[in-house]
């Protein structure tokens, strides 16, 4: 399915947050291990009626630098964000499409690990690895290699490392021409591809109907984003849970910090800073406890990631047009109505009095004068026959009189203007309203 609406073009980007997973007790500061934003993906506009094409994703690897030793066990949060490119006031609008989290064990210098995580109707496939920046080496990046100029006891092509000079490491050389972005090797001379890429040198993007594959160069954190398949097919267990089929359905065995039928209840805590747009996070610091985001006005969603469409509540009354300006709501009122929510039915009498003793009356929200005897027109400024407006209802006869008009009512009607039928037409012993009318429906009389 498309992440963009037919009205507005959009583009995707990713946010990655890493935190050390060494200590179970202490709440780490948000993204203490590192955080990164990907580049924006290509602009995408949905074509109404057309099938969803390959989803354009941000280019290149997403690198999260970490300053200290690699902890081995870490927690991650990967968010897929949509940026709507319209003429919104205040610039582009961001909204969170998918958010996945997990805790993993990973040694630095090891091979690429592949992962599949589910978030609602989306599935995020990504590959990751931890790599030491020279001169650091080792599974925790704590050992330092000597500079190349230092005397070496290692043979040709091998590097000496401190503190144990007899440990010599062979630099891993992949197959010649293997894509540095989309390929990797665990053995010298091989070229293995990241999710979404194929070919002997991992330079050919995979394009399948079942997966909204990236176009052009891909991101290591984002192979593809696709609607999820059925039970145990592609692993319905989120957050690294393992799926086992049962006679009736399936069962997920969840890793520590996740629970629920599909391990969908996140082990993310307030320490990870999961609440966006100024939302207040409430919940325990313990990794197994849930959290709740209390959103500021104008935002909603479990992570305060969605801007509230305040116009959907139809705050403007009497047919007023609602405008959500972000910082405030505005109602553009129809003629004859006013007020912040168009709640006042104007008779416009304050600004435009009726002349010659006329009185202002409601006329569907517009100014209307009921004129005194002998006057007519919009503001009662014209001399007129008082009976010209047919002021007597139900066929009553109008007579101009020095003190005003008089209605002589037809038989069966009464009232100053003959507006009350003594026995309403069609109101026999049974119907609760005249024939053909439900109670509350209008009946027109000439």
């Amino acid at each position: 399915r498309s992440p963009c609406s037919a009205r507005l073009p959009c583009r995707l980007f990713f946010r990655v947050c890493l935190k050390p997973g060494l200590s179970e007790e202490a709440a780490e500061s948000p993204c203490a291990l590192g955080a990164a934003l990907s580049a924006r993906g290509p602009v995408y506009t949905e074509q109404p009626g057309a099938p969803a094409p390959d989803l354009p994703l941000p280019d290149g690897l997403l690198q999260v630098p970490f300053r200290d030793a690699w902890p081995g066990t870490f927690s991650f949060i990967i968010e897929t964000w949509r940026e709507e490119l319209g003429d919104q006031i205040g610039g582009p609008a961001w909204s969170l499409l998918a958010r996945v989290a997990g805790r993993r064990r990973l040694a630095a210098g090891g091979p690429w690990a592949r992962d599949i995580q589910r978030a609602g109707a989306w599935e995020l496939r990504f590959s990751y690895r931890a790599r030491c920046e020279p001169p650091a080496v080792g599974t925790a990046c704590t050992r330092l290699c000597r500079p190349r100029s230092a005397p070496s006891r290692c043979g040709p092509g091998l590097r000496p490392c401190a503190p144990l000079e007899d440990e010599c490491e062979a630099p891993l050389v992949c197959r010649a021409g293997c894509s540095p972005e989309h390929g990797f090797c665990e053995q010298p001379g091989e070229c293995r591809c990241l999710e979404g890429w194929t070919g002997p040198l991992c330079t050919v993007p995979v394009s399948t109907s079942s997966c909204l594959s990236p176009r052009g160069p891909s991101s290591a954190t984002t192979g593809c984003l696709v609607p999820g398949p059925g039970p145990c097919d592609g692993n319905p267990c989120a957050n690294g849970g393992s799926c086992s089929e049962t006679p009736r359905s399936f069962e997920c065995t969840c890793p520590r910090g996740f629970y629920g039928l599909r391990c969908e209840v996140s082990g993310v805590t307030c320490a990870d800073g999961p609440c966006f747009n100024g939302g207040l996070c409430v919940g325990g610091a313990d990794p197994d406890s849930a959290y709740i985001c209390h959103c500021p006005p104008g935002f909603q969603g479990s992570n305060c990631e969605k801007r509230v469409d305040r116009c959907s509540l139809q705050p403007c009354r009497n047919g007023g047009l609602c405008l959500d300006l972000g910082h405030a709501l505005r109602c553009r009122c129809r003629a004859g109505f006013a007020g912040p929510r168009c709640e006042h039915d104007l008779d416009d009498c304050a600004g435009r009095a009726c002349a010659n003793g006329g009185t202002c009356v409601e006329g569907g929200g517009a100014h209307r004068c009921s004129c005194a005897l002998g006057f007519g027109g919009r503001d009662c400024r014209e001399r007129a026959d008082p009976c010209a407006a047919r002021p007597c209802a139900h066929g009553g006869r109008c007579y101009a009189h020095f003190s005003g008009l008089v209605c002589a009512c037809a038989p069966g009607y009464m009232g100053a203007r003959c507006e009350f039928p003594v026995h309403p037409d069609g109101a026999s012993a049974l119907p609760a309203a005249p024939p053909g009318l439900r109670p509350g429906d209008p009946q027109r009389y000439l």
């Epitope: 009356v361 409601e362 209307r368 209802a393 009232g415 100053a416 309403p424 209008p442 009946q443 009389y445």
Partner: nanobody, 117 residues
Framework: QVQLQESGGGLVQPGGSLRLSCAAS????????MAWYRQAPGKKRELVAG???????NYVDSVKGRFTISRDNAKNTVYLQMNSLQPEDTAVYYC???????????WGQGTQVTVSS
């Protein structure tokens, strides 16, 4: 469109009192001619009392001196105060509105009034 909702009906003993209310929405009652009608079993619906836009009131002879029609523009409601109720006042009471703009009439759903010992 004008909507009318009656309330206040019920069972009362002869000589007792009731006050019926008719809440209007969709237009101000000050711009409507409003009335109360009633329909007893097996009989035609008949006018009980009416109040015109100018505030003048009309009553059928059988209720004069006992019933009073009034309106509260602030609450957009018309009332029928019924005193000295008799068994012959037993009926379904309907609220009625006549809107001069367009000359439409509107009816409420009705409320049952029963006078019995």
């Amino acid at each position: 469109q004008v909507q009318l909702q009656e309330s206040g009906g019920g069972l009362v003993q002869p000589g007792g009192s009731l006050r019926l209310s008719c809440a209007a929405s969709g237009s101000s009652v000050s711009f409507l001619s409003m009335a109360w009608y009633r329909q007893a079993p097996g009989k035609k619906r008949e006018l009980v009392a009416g109040i015109s836009t100018d505030g003048s009131t009309n009553y059928v002879d059988s209720v004069k001196g006992r019933f009073t029609i009034s309106r509260d523009n602030a609450k957009n409601t018309v009332y029928l105060q019924m005193n000295s109720l008799q068994p012959e006042d037993t009926a379904v009471y309907y609220c009625y509105a006549y809107r001069w703009v367009g000359r439409y009439t509107y009816w409420g759903q009705g409320t049952q009034v029963t006078v019995s010992s």
